[in-house]
Interface confidence: low
Amino acid sequence: MRTEAQVPALQPPEPGLEGAMGHRTLVLPWVLLTLCVTAGTPEVWVQVRMEATELSSFTIRCGFLGSGSISLVTVSWGGPNGAGGTTLAVLHPERGIRQWAPARQARWETQSSISLILEGSGASSPCANTTFCCKFASFPEGSWEACGSLPPSSDPGLSAPPTPAPILRADLAGILGVSGVLLFGCVYLLHLLRRHKHRPAPRLQPSRTSPQAPRARAWAPSQASQAALHVPYATINTSCRPATLDTAHPHGGPSWWASLPTHAAHRPQGPAAWASTPIPARGSFVSVENGLYAQAGERPPHTGPGLTLFPDPRGPRAMEGPLGVR
């Protein structure tokens, strides 16, 4: 038994969740949704689950409903990654996985879905209403993120209704090319969904078939500075007291992004779609929890009293985040 919350509600319903009439009524919206997804407006779903057997253990599962190839997945808590959220794990389909406490196991479930287990005992566990976010960077859709959390009143072992609506931030470039007809269809879909708002939101346990282990391998990025993905975010407040969460600050991406796929040059240029922020050519994967990210070189210095992390003969580097000067 488990408590779970899922985002978004825009998921194919499980058989038996609704009566025959209700199911038939939703056929058209799902067809339209499929068209929307394949036409360049992908969705991200997030499922947060708390095991009844281990109350401090959370499982976050995220999936990408889009046709593009996923280049990076970032899981964060406390709000969107880049807007005060703390990164828990970063998964790259080729270059492997890196994670941060209290993440215990991050893994690919399929080519388009991931799971992450958060461990904890007592104080080290996230509170039940913590917001968890998954951001999928893909080509050509761009960056999409959704967030979800367990309802504060969730009792272990009881199924919680899914979060009613997704929190999505789309790279504007990701919706270029959508025809007017499909846009109308999507609007109509939303209209239909709003009419069905009084119903329990349909749920989908994303397929666990054909799991793909990440092809982790040693990787040496090119020395050239590359463009980083940058998406404007809206801050999501969590009702957790700050003391119960590891504080986070805005930050840059991992050094994995120092070498982008060859098709990067063909990414559509939309407003705030791809910023020209330089990424370190080669260097450490700096924990984003601290909020520092060296734009070049091995390690950012810290502004804490008397604390210098691996002094670099190349001198000071530009940094992102509140503890450094950009």
């Epitope: 904890g120 104080a123 982790a216 040693a218 924990s287």
Partner: antibody, heavy 119, light 107 residues
Framework: QVQLQESGPGLVKPSETLSLTCTVS?????????WNWIRQPPGKGLEWIGY???????NYNPSLKSRVTISVDTSKNQFSLKLSSVTAADTAVYYC????????????WGQGTTVTVSS | DIQMTQSPSSLSASVGDRVTITCRAS??????LHWYQQKPGKAPKLLIK???DSISGVPSRFSGSGSGTDFTLTISSLQPEDFATYYC?????????FGGGTKLEIK
Amino acid sequence: QVQLQESGPGLVKPSETLSLTCTVSGYSISSDYAWNWIRQPPGKGLEWIGYIRYNGNTNYNPSLKSRVTISVDTSKNQFSLKLSSVTAADTAVYYCAIIYYDYDGFVYWGQGTTVTVSS
Amino acid sequence: DIQMTQSPSSLSASVGDRVTITCRASQNVYENLHWYQQKPGKAPKLLIKFASDSISGVPSRFSGSGSGTDFTLTISSLQPEDFATYYCLQLYSTPYTFGGGTKLEIK
């Protein structure tokens, strides 16, 4: 530069509680990072005991979890280890160490303090 | 728990030799593998992080490679000060676990 210094009794009787303190200088313990305890029995390898994060969150090695408590005293800029019901197998050099940026590795360590469990 | 198996447990070599130490994880730890050097009576010192990332201040003769479950620490040309015990450490999943160590001795 941050420095860590372990302190505590060098001799503990079996079944008693081992208590060690790590005093941190050069950095505010409540500001960031994870503060760890690691031990090394004589002539043997290293074993991670657990950590306390800057915000008070803890994580312990399951093999020791029932006996371990790690706490922090921000007013003294210290964090402490308590290991109950000790036996001779707990005789070791105990190190405190800091993890910068989480999984980047234990960069700074204390010099270690030897604890012998004997009656 | 993830078990880390280091080999060899001891190694005799001469100054100028090229030395390779291996570490195997019982399950995939991706790149979350770090190498340490420990000298008698001293605390361990971080040599390599994330399997292959060098550390500022550590001589360039130390290098690391590998990903997943198999990792290697290489010392390209042994120096007198390199004779010590070397440990690998996985920080992918708690409990963090060290390898059993490789004692590098002078031949």
